[in-house]
């Protein structure tokens, strides 16, 4: 069962002193969800038992285990159900406390009931405040029975509830017809799934004959102990004041468990802490009564003594819950009440004993579950005990349950039992995650759910390149973090499994499934160098770069120019996806600006090293096209050009350029400067007979401006070859400018 | 479906006796208090007689105490009215019905459940 | 004991005219505790209004109940042809329980 533990404090005479504490002694309890369990919730529960609203009440998490509900202002606060969550997964498990106004009409003479399927469950109300008027039982908030106000019997009314069944289980009350609920006596009844004394899906297995006031749960066997024991059958006191499935937690304040209310996992339900009654739990218990609620008798044998928290305290020479048995009497010590393997593990279970006559190996026996006989192996005899070992065959999950050590002397027997736990080894159901990768190192996250039994104690990470048969390698790592694997090889598919162990011999499960992650290519690693760059024009820039020469074959897929233009904080980035390009021409920039320029070699996603920058500056942009621009052939080898000047000129123009190309020829076309800016007209000379040009022409300010409008025009007749053009220019006569 | 169902009315002599049942089926019938009405030709509803949950407890209306004795069997889930002594004023149709209390607070009653009634004429 | 008073004894209306019936106790009664029912010719009664105003399962919401103390009242607030009927009220206390004369409504 879940260690969680509901505590009330009911000093009820300070509704603001009225506190209740939940404490779970599960490992990682209450720290939520960067723990492996969800945290503790501590909350009144207004579904079946409501009350006035009041302000609310506060929650205060004290460490990762306890949480305390305060702020309770008025005795109507502190009427209702109650509950604690705890525990993670299947675990999971609520604990409620009930509570009962003191100044109700009726009372419960006892709250929580917890009975057998199949048994008759009497609910008892006491009358506090007598009215003369019908008295309703409801369960769970619904009308359930009816008693007329003289069917009281001793001044109480009696709800029998006869053949109960797990569903009948829940929150009853009784209540005056015409009174609040405030006034009602609220019960908890808790209907164990089995008959008395048995446990287990068709409640076939036999309980473990719980001690001290246990009840033994009608699930896993295991015995709820009352507050204040411990033990696989409850058989052993805590201390004074301590309580928990180990006694690890203490009461809090001098006056130790006293007026404090213990509520435990189902199907134990509430009591008072050991040595205390009544129904604030503030009376000790009477001579002779000791544990929860003091509702055992000590009966002490042969001179013992009855403490009201432990039971019999029992003089030299004997023992025994009632000092009954004689130390000659052999006796099984220190057996460990709970055990834990890994299913398919063969372990070895040691039970020492003592007696007189001596035991010896024989005479020390071990019982499974199913009733299989183990005898001891070997034996190691020492002055005071004999320890038997025994080697137990490989381990099935049907060998959990109840184990029992035996030892029988001619000086009588004595036997002990312990729980075993067979654990499953827990297998991934799903493949590792890929966060990153890298050329040579893939960053992966092994933590994945599992089926089989925690916690995990250490998580390994297999893999080997995809379709391999070398062996696989392997990595060992902590379950909550992330895993690199290192010196793989770029561009490499490699296969990954992941293995997951809990503690203890055999813990190891088997793998999870593969899942295939691939390694990046490797880095580039030459770093070019910028040869050169020339503007050809305001907004163009055509670059040259260089390689170092080094064996083999490149490495790289392309290129990657970028240019800053640190004034606008801006960055261009241009793709050159040929590894054999060494130049690029970069158009679209802004003229008259000042760029930083460089260039890496790129493979893949990965980028190699940059190139030193260089600093380029674009001249301004140029004034406006000239207009009008027109060809005229005077002869087999001249053309005049006439044109007018640019319109909203930003300054004066230092020169034209006229561009030059033979139509529908392959050849780079050829610029000729105009030096004196206020001409209007040109001649080109030197061209070709009966050959068509195109021409085009522009300004220049600062920097070059934009193209006019081409023109073709052909040279007259069948002339010798010119040696190419040239030009002569003058200002255009009024005669000329047509 | 829940519901009741009457018999063993007639007629019958002033001063004889009669014995009428009630069947209840469909809901636990061990848990309710049931009751009698009784209503006149041509009269209102007069209540009769009531019975708790476990049959320790009766209660009638003055003018049929010490001649009419309500009982139920649980086992049977059936209601009984024994009648004794009749008198023409007894004459009517009589209904059985069940008793409800709402869960909520305040508790609230009603009978909201009526069988579809018996006839018994006391007549010479 | 707690005597119930229904008036009028008789209300003749037409159908989708209002409705109203009064029930007075003799002495203060729990609102918790009254409750109407309807009766048909030849049929036994149906419970309408339980604590005083809440309607049963199935009751038509031009039914309502209202009232405390010792003056409760049941209002139809659109008569339809079904609902011409004689009407009762009844307190559960301390024994006797006791039912009021009725009121029929009849088609006028």
């Known amino acids: 069962a879940v260690d969680l533990t509901l505590l009330a404090n009911l000093r009820l005479t300070d509704p603001q002193r009225f506190f209740l504490t939940c404490v779970s002694g599960e490992a990682g309890a209450g720290r939520g969800s960067d723990a492996w369990g969800p945290p503790l919730l501590l909350e009144k529960d207004d579904r079946i038992v409501r009350t006035p609203p009041g302000p609310p009440l506060r929650l205060a998490r004290n460490g990762s285990h306890q949480v305390t509900l305060r702020g309770f202002s008025k005795p109507s606060d502190l009427v209702g159900v109650f509950s604690c969550v705890g525990g993670a997964g299947a675990r999971r498990t609520r604990v409620i406390y009930v509570h009962n106004s003191p100044g109700a009409h009726l009372l419960p003479d006892k709250v929580t009931h917890t009975v057998n399927k199949g048994d008759t469950a009497v609910l008892s109300a006491r009358v506090h405040k007598e009215k003369q008027t019908d008295v309703i039982w409801k369960s769970n908030g619904s009308y359930f029975y009816t008693l007329d106000w003289h069917e009281a019997q001793d001044g109480r009314f009696l709800l029998q509830l006869p053949n109960v069944q797990p569903p009948s289980s829940g929150i009853y009350s009784a209540t005056y017809l015409e009174a609040s609920p405030l006034g009602s006596a609220f019960f908890r009844l808790i209907v164990r799934g089995c008959g008395a004394g048995r446990w287990g899906p068709g409640c076939t297995k036999e309980c473990p004959g719980c001690l001290h006031g246990g009840v033994c749960h009608d699930h896993d066997g295991e015995c709820v102990c009352p507050p204040g024991f411990t033990g696989t059958r409850c058989e052993q006191a805590c201390r004074e004041g301590r309580f928990g499935q180990s006694c690890q937690e203490q009461c809090p304040g001098i006056s130790g468990c006293r007026g404090l209310t213990f509520c435990l996992p189902d199907p134990y339900g509430c009591s008072c802490g050991s040595g205390w009654r009544g129904s604030q739990c503030q009376e000790a218990c009477a001579p002779g009564h000791f544990g929860a609620d003091c509702r055992l008798q000590c009966q002490c044998q042969n001179g013992g003594t009855c403490d009201r928290f432990s039971g019999c305290v029992c003089p030299s020479g004997w023992h025994g819950v009632h000092c009954e048995k004689s130390d000659r009497i052999p006796q099984i010590l220190n057996m460990a009440s709970e055990l834990e393997f890994n299913l398919e593990t063969m372990p070895r279970i040691n039970c020492a004993a003592a007696g007189n006559p001596f035991p010896v190996r024989g005479s020390i026996e071990l019982r499974k579950p199913d009733g299989t006989v183990l005898l001891s192996t070997k034996a190691i005899v020492e002055p005071e005990k004999t320890t038997a070992e025994f080697e137990v065959p490989r381990l099935v999950l049907a060998d959990s349950g109840f184990w029992e050590c035996r030892v029988s002397t001619s000086g009588g027997q004595d036997s002990r039992r312990f729980k075993v736990n067979v654990k499953v080894p827990p297998v991934p159901l799903a493949a590792p995650r890929l966060l990153t990768k890298q050329s040579r190192q893939l960053v992966v996250s092994p933590l994945v759910s599992f089926s089989g039994d925690g916690p995990i104690s250490t998580v390994r990470l297999h893999y080997r390149p995809q379709d391999s048969t070398m062996d696989w390698s392997t990595i060992v790592v902590d379950p909550s973090e992330n895993v690199t694997l290192m010196n793989l090889r770029p561009k490499t598919g490699y296969s990954v499994r992941v293995q997951l162990s809990r503690p203890g011999e055999g813990g190891e499960g088997a793998w999870g499934p593969p899942t295939l992650m691939t390694t990046d290519c490797p880095e580039p690693l030459l770093q070019p160098w910028l040869e050169g760059w020339h503007v050809e024009g305001t907004d163009r820039l055509r670059v040259s770069w260089s390689l170092p020469l080094v064996p083999g074959p490149l490495v790289g897929d392309g290129f990657l120019l970028r240019l800053w233009d640190g004034t606008r904080g801006q960055e261009r980035r241009e793709n050159v996806s040929s590894p054999q390009a060494r130049t690029a021409l970069l158009t679209g920039l802004t003229p008259g600006t000042h760029y930083q320029l460089d260039v890496q070699l790129y493979h893949c996603t990965l980028l190699g090293p940059a190139s030193p920058p260089a600093h380029v500056l674009l001249p301004p942009s140029g004034p406006p096209a000239p207009r009008h621009l027109h060809a005229q052939a005077l002869s087999d080898s001249e053309i005049q050009l006439t044109w007018k000047h640019p319109e909203a000129l930003p300054g004066p123009i230092s020169k034209y350029v006229v561009e030059v190309q033979v139509a529908g020829g392959a050849g780079d076309p050829l610029w000729i400067d105009v030096d004196r800016p206020e001409e209007t007209s040109t001649i080109i000379r030197g061209l070709n007979a009966s050959t068509r040009y195109l021409f085009r022409m522009r300004a220049s300010i600062q920097g070059l401006g934009d193209w006019s409008n081409t023109v073709e025009e052909s040279t007259l007749g069948n002339g010798l070859q010119a040696e190419g053009p040239v030009q002569e220019s003058r200002a255009a006569e009024e005669g000329l400018d047509q | 479906e829940v519901q009741l169902l009457e018999s063993g009315g007639g007629l019958v002599q002033p001063g004889g006796s009669l014995r009428l049942s009630c069947a209840a089926s469909g809901f636990t019938f061990s848990r309710y208090r049931m009751d009698w009405v009784r209503q006149a030709p041509g009269k209102g509803l007069e209540w009769v007689s009531g019975i708790y949950p476990s049959g320790g407890h009766t209660y009638y209306a003055d003018s049929v105490k010490g001649r009419f004795t309500i009982s139920r069997d649980n086992s049977k889930n059936t209601l009984y009215l024994q009648m004794n002594s009749l008198r023409a004023e007894d004459t009517a149709t009589y209904y059985c019905?069940?008793?409800?209390?709402?869960?909520?607070?305040?508790?609230?009653?009603?009978?909201?459940?009526w069988g579809q009634g018996t006839m018994v004429t006391v007549s010479s | 004991d707690i005597q119930m008073t229904q008036s009028p004894g008789t209300l003749s209306l037409s159908p989708g005219e209002r409705a109203t019936l009064s029930c007075r106790a003799s002495q203060s009664v729990s609102s918790t505790y009254l409750a109407w029912y309807q009766q048909k010719p030849g049929q036994a009664p149906r419970l309408l209004i339980y604590g005083a105003s809440s309607r049963a399962t199935g009751i038509p919401d031009r039914f309502t109940g209202s009232g405390s103390g010792t003056d409760f009242t049941l209002t139809i607030s659109r008569l339809e042809p079904e609902d011409f009927a004689v009407y009762y009220c009844?307190?559960?206390?301390?024994?006797?329980?006791?039912f009021g004369g009725g009121t029929k409504v009849e088609i006028k």
């Open positions: 009844q307190h559960y206390g301390s024994s006797p329980l006791t």
């Open positions: 019905a069940r008793l409800y209390l709402w869960g909520s607070y305040p508790t609230q009653v009603a009978f909201d459940i």
